[in-house]
């Protein structure tokens, strides 16, 4: 079974800068899975942000504009990355990755 690790416990960024979060997949080939990213803002329910499927197709939360969150995967390091562009106060949250084994 696949296992996920998010090595960064926290990330502090200056407003308008870029934040890059990592999710390391082990126990399964990342190219054979779909990785999902969610966020939980203080006092709010968890929210789906974006996913990247085994074939590379990206799907995002339709209510969030393109260009805000960028998801990628690096097979060589078995890592999925979530890049948050132009960091703002409403991006303060806990971000989670999740795995869907195909």
């Amino acid at each position: 079974a696949g296992h996920l690790e998010q090595p960064q416990i926290s990330s502090t960024k200056t407003l308008s800068k870029t934040a890059r979060l990592e999710c390391v997949v082990s126990g399964i080939t990342i190219s054979a899975t779909s990785v999902y990213w969610y966020r939980e803002r203080p006092g709010e329910v968890i929210q789906f942000l974006v996913s990247i499927s085994y074939d590379g197709t990206v799907r995002k939360e339709s209510g969030i504009p393109s260009g805000k969150f960028e998801v990628d995967r690096i097979p060589e390091t078995s890592t999925s990355t979530l890049t948050i562009h132009n960091v703002e106060k409403q991006d303060i949250a806990t971000y989670y990755c999740a795995l869907w084994e195909v």
Epitope: I64, P65, G67, K68, H85
Partner: antibody, heavy 118, light 108 residues
Framework: EVQLVESGGGLVKPGGSLRLSCAAS????????LTWVRQAPGKGLEWVSS????????FYADSVKGRFTISRDNAKNSLYLQMNSLRAEDTAVYYC???????????WGQGTTVTVSS | EIVMTQSPGTLSLSPGERATLSCRAS???????LAWFQQKPGQAPRRLIY???SRATGIPDRFSGSGSGTDFTLTISRLEPEDFAVYYC?????????FGGGTKVEIK
């Protein structure tokens, strides 16, 4: 069927203002982020602005920042673009478009023409 | 800002021929965030391809996209009369979203 209908274009003098509207139907308007894109006469496409479903995220192209304001009214299924301090280089056809789960510009309106001239 | 450059500016071909349109990004773009659009005179653009290679709903399979990094290609395997139009590439991985300058495919 998804429909986007822009209105509000017209002729305006440099320094003037105009408010564009985009009336939407055929989809869950309040769940989608939306965009404005423009096309100057005989030129290519230029992204202008985007707004999230709840209006919490708003982005602008540098060329319009501080002059244009994007907004939406989910109760009226409408998107707006308030354009102030208009310049000749803002002359273009303005399109509204959806920004769905598979990326932006999946559905487009027919466009409304803005001409800035003295 | 990621600058998208398309070539050639104009492509003169006959119906039935193969069209190959190029798009180059000024910095690396994830292939998941590259789209192609078609625009005919007096009409709004229409999305053909998203994610560099996935066809949008209702797009014929003679249209195909490929590429990664900074170099992307749109191929029309056999040009039909209705395919003569202007084509734009666009990246949507990061704001500002940027379009290429377009390639006009005209009848030879």
């Amino acid at each position: 069927e998804v429909q986007l209908v822009e209105s509000g274009g017209g002729l305006v003098k440099p320094g003037g203002s105009l408010r564009l509207s985009c009336a939407a139907s055929g989809f869950a308007f309040s769940s989608y982020s939306l965009t404005w894109v423009r096309q100057a006469p005989g030129k290519g496409l230029e992204w202008v602005s985007s707004i999230s479903s709840s209006s919490s995220y708003i982005f602008y192209a540098d060329s319009v920042k501080g002059r244009f304001t994007i907004s939406r009214d989910n109760a009226k299924n409408s998107l707006y673009l308030q354009m102030n301090s208009l310049r000749a280089e803002d002359t273009a056809v303005y399109y509204c478009a959806t920004d769905g789960e598979l990326g932006p510009f999946d559905y487009w309106g027919q466009g409304t023409t803005v001409t800035v001239s003295s | 800002e990621i600058v998208m450059t398309q070539s050639p500016g104009t492509l003169s071909l006959s119906p039935g021929e193969r069209a190959t349109l190029s798009c180059r990004a000024s910095q690396s773009v994830s292939s998941s965030y590259l789209a192609w659009f078609q625009q005919k005179p007096g009409q709004a653009p229409r999305r053909l391809i998203y994610g560099a290679s996935s066809r949008a709903t209702g797009i014929p399979d003679r249209f195909s996209g490929s590429g990664s990094g900074t170099d992307f290609t749109l191929t029309i395997s056999r040009l039909e009369p209705e395919d003569f139009a202007v084509y734009y590439c666009q990246q949507y991985g990061r704001s500002p979203l940027t379009f290429g300058g377009g390639t006009k495919v005209e009848i030879k």
